[in-house]
């Protein structure tokens, strides 16, 4: 549906509040270093312009594309060259190349200060003094640190953020009310950002077909009663939404997401019986709820898959007629029967099936050739099952912190060239799979664990892509999206790695560690553990465990000492010497 003015169209569809919020997110995700005030100024200028177009769609420049309008606006920033260096060269390009150029310069790990949470009273005063600015600042700070955050979902987070302050700043104990809510929003926000980053990586690095395959599998698990044609329609629409958001087209994305939610709710009966509650909610909550909705019950008496996909004499004929449709149907049928499988496993099975048909449909006796294709699935299914069983066993034995440490050692040995902060961050997140998924019964463990691991390993991939240091990481990240986790799992110790020189400063600790939060203290100890493995990659787990136990005792002892700093200095030297002897450093 062509509109004379795209900007007027989106302003009317979304309303002024959402329009302004989405433009702010878009600008902050592109120009991540710009001050808040500069972005607000740009957003206000764009909004005023949009209003003139609403009043008269034929007014000057109103017929320009959003990319042209937004790009022109971003290119007016005076300090572009000083602040962003070569990104300023984007402004010499024409659309669509200019937008592609901006997208390529999005930074997954921007050099920004950590967000420090002020005192509750300070936050409440700021909230009451200027609610609008306070909430805009939230959008800005999240968007610039998470340049692929799913914009319409960020509006939902902002709504909850506002609700938390509205409620808690009036409470008797403001802190007790507010802090747990903010912690929850922070943790959920990080998870949401990482999940969306995988969707964007899937689209940008592996293409639309890869994303659509993922969507077919996931939606078929979620809506097993829906017909294939219905699932296909939802997949097409969902792909459009995420392509837009990942491409920086946030107004179109939010608009299309609202349309998709509307469609799903109008067609609940042919989609899922679990949507009723979601569809009674306001728009932002509704969209979020649909995205998180539990899997519907599988239809009773689904026939065996073998009839249509192995035993039928028309398999090759059906495949040849429309390859992707036939593979899509296979994936749909397999996924709706297997909510107990991870999406990535389902995609591996579909790939195996596709490879077999490619080979067998060209053979003398195709049926004889593909008759045993389902037997090839067994080892593919058992591999993640075994891995999850083993790691949950270790998690239950160790608890989260020590389980993270085991993963830190494991991944540092596999890819020791990766920076220590990245190894710590990724391994800590990998370790959270234990608390998140091991509590589930068998039928829910694999989809929980393996699909979560895909999200975390994508973090490693995008961080590594910015500064590539390991051919093994590059290989696992780029060869196959669905085989990333098995690729990393299969890595043994990197025999080519030259151990890092010993540096006493790396293992020198001070009394300030005693005042850190438990989480920060863990990160300090885990940083030391990674450095230890980088110095001594051949150290056994028993050796490392002994050193870490001694280290924990040392920190505990010195934090209880009267003269903490002296204790850290003297006992620290002894600990380093003992560790060197134990590990033969």
């Amino acid at each position: 549906d062509a509109h004379k003015s795209e900007v007027a169209h989106r302003f009317k569809d979304l309303g002024e509040e959402n329009f302004k919020a989405l433009v702010l997110i878009a600008f902050a995700q592109y120009l991540q270093q710009c001050p808040f005030e500069d972005h607000v100024k740009l957003v206000n200028e764009v909004t005023e312009f949009a209003k003139t177009c609403v009043a008269d769609e034929s007014a000057e420049n109103c017929d320009k594309s959003l990319h042209t309008l937004f790009g022109d606006k971003l290119c007016t920033v005076a300090t572009l060259r000083e602040t962003y260096g070569e990104m300023a060269d984007c402004c010499a390009k024409q659309e669509p190349e200019r937008n592609e150029c901006f997208l390529q310069h999005k930074d997954d790990n921007p050099n920004l200060p950590r967000l420090v949470r002020p005192e509750v009273d300070v936050m409440c005063t700021a909230f009451h003094d200027n609610e609008e600015t306070f909430l805009k600042k939230y959008l800005y700070e999240i968007a610039r640190r998470h340049p692929y955050f799913y914009a319409p979902e960020l509006l939902f987070f902002a709504k909850r953020y506002k609700a938390a302050f509205t409620e808690c700043c009036q409470a008797a104990d403001k802190a007790a009310c507010l802090l747990p809510k903010l912690d929850e929003l922070r943790d959920e926000g990080k998870a949401s950002s990482a999940k969306q980053r995988l969707k964007c990586a899937s689209l940008q690095k592996f293409g639309e077909r890869a994303f659509k395959a993922w969507a077919v599998a996931r939606l078929s698990q979620r809506f097993p009663k829906a017909e294939f044609a219905e699932v296909s329609k939802l997949v097409t629409d969902l792909t459009k939404v995420h392509t837009e958001c990942c491409h920086g087209d946030l107004l179109e994305c939010a608009d299309d997401r609202a349309d998709l939610a509307k469609y799903i709710c109008e067609n609940q009966d042919s989609i899922s019986s679990k949507l009723k509650e979601c569809c009674e909610k306001p728009l932002l909550e509704k969209s979020h709820c649909i995205a998180e909705v539990e899997n519907d019950e599988m239809p009773a008496d689904l026939p065996s898959l073998a009839a249509d996909f192995v035993e039928s004499k028309d398999v090759c004929k059906n495949y040849a007629e429309a390859k992707d449709v036939f593979l899509g149907m296979f994936l749909y049928e397999y996924a709706r029967r297997h909510p107990d499988y991870s999406v990535v496993l389902l995609l591996r099975l579909a790939k195996t099936y596709e490879t077999t048909l490619e080979k067998c449909c060209a053979a003398a006796d195709p049926h004889e050739c593909y008759a045993k294709v389902f037997d090839e699935f067994k080892p593919l299914v058992e591999e993640p099952q075994n891995l999850i069983k083993q790691n949950c066993e270790l998690f239950e034995q160790l608890g989260e912190y020590k389980f993270q440490n085991a993963l830190l050692v494991r991944y540092t040995k596999k890819v020791p060239q990766v920076s220590t902060p990245t190894l710590v961050e990724v391994s800590r997140n990998l370790g959270k799979v234990g608390s998140k998924c091991c509590k589930h019964p068998e039928a829910k463990r694999m989809p929980c664990a393996e699909d979560y691991l895909s999200v975390v390993l994508n973090q490693l991939c995008v961080l590594h892509e910015k500064t590539p240091v390991s051919d093994r990481v590059t290989k696992c990240c780029t060869e196959s999206l669905v085989n990333r986790r098995p690729c990393f799992s299969a890595l043994e110790v990197d025999e080519t790695y030259v151990p890092k020189e010993f540096n006493a400063e790396t293992f020198t600790f001070h009394a300030d560690i005693c005042t850190l939060s438990e989480k920060e203290r863990q990160i300090k100890k885990q940083t030391a553990l990674v450095e230890l493995v980088k110095h001594k990659p051949k150290a056994t787990k028993e050796q490392l465990k002994a050193v870490m136990d001694d280290f924990a005792a040392f920190v505990e002892k010195c934090c209880k000492a009267d003269d903490k700093e002296t204790c850290f200095a003297e006992e620290g030297k002894k600990l380093v010497a003992a560790s060197q002897a134990a590990l033969g450093l």
Partner: nanobody, 124 residues
Framework: QVQLVESGGGLVQPGGSLRLSCAAS????????MGWFRQPPGKEREFVAS????????YYADSVKGRFTISRDDAKNMGYLQMSSLKPEDTAVYYC?????????????????WGRGTQVTVSS
């Protein structure tokens, strides 16, 4: 420390059987998982089978599933690998290894202690 010594290797015809043993001494063997790895001539070391510390979970490489059986006898501080329907591609040096987590991982670097290996040759 745990010391591991493998035995039972030798020359066998295709289709034949062998039983490898792994004798452990030193620390309490029952707290460790046990694994068998092999290194075929001119190739990397590869996982064959493992058994966790309690003996209730066993894992096998796809290439040996249904032909090899891993077991342990903690009273004797022994581990075993029963190999049947042997093929020429099973020819390798077989190593026994102990894992302090007690899990029985697939990756060799997860194992703290290793034996020196025993040669298995399958040939007619």
């Amino acid at each position: 420390q745990v010391q591991l010594v493998e035995s039972g290797g030798g020359l066998v015809q295709p289709g034949g059987s062998l039983r490898l043993s792994c004798a452990a001494s030193g620390r309490i063997f029952s707290t460790y998982a046990m694994g068998w790895f092999r290194q075929p001539p001119g190739k990397e070391r590869e996982f064959v089978a493992s058994i966790n510390r309690s003996g209730d979970s066993t894992y096998y490489a796809d290439s040996v599933k249904g032909r090899f059986t891993i077991s342990r006898d903690d009273a004797k501080n022994m581990g075993y690998l029963q190999m049947s329907s042997l093929k020429p591609e099973d020819t390798a040096v077989y190593y026994c290894a102990a894992d302090s987590d007690g899990i029985g991982w697939f990756n060799s670097f997860e194992y703290d202690y290793w034996g020196r290996g025993t040669q298995v040759t399958v040939s007619s």
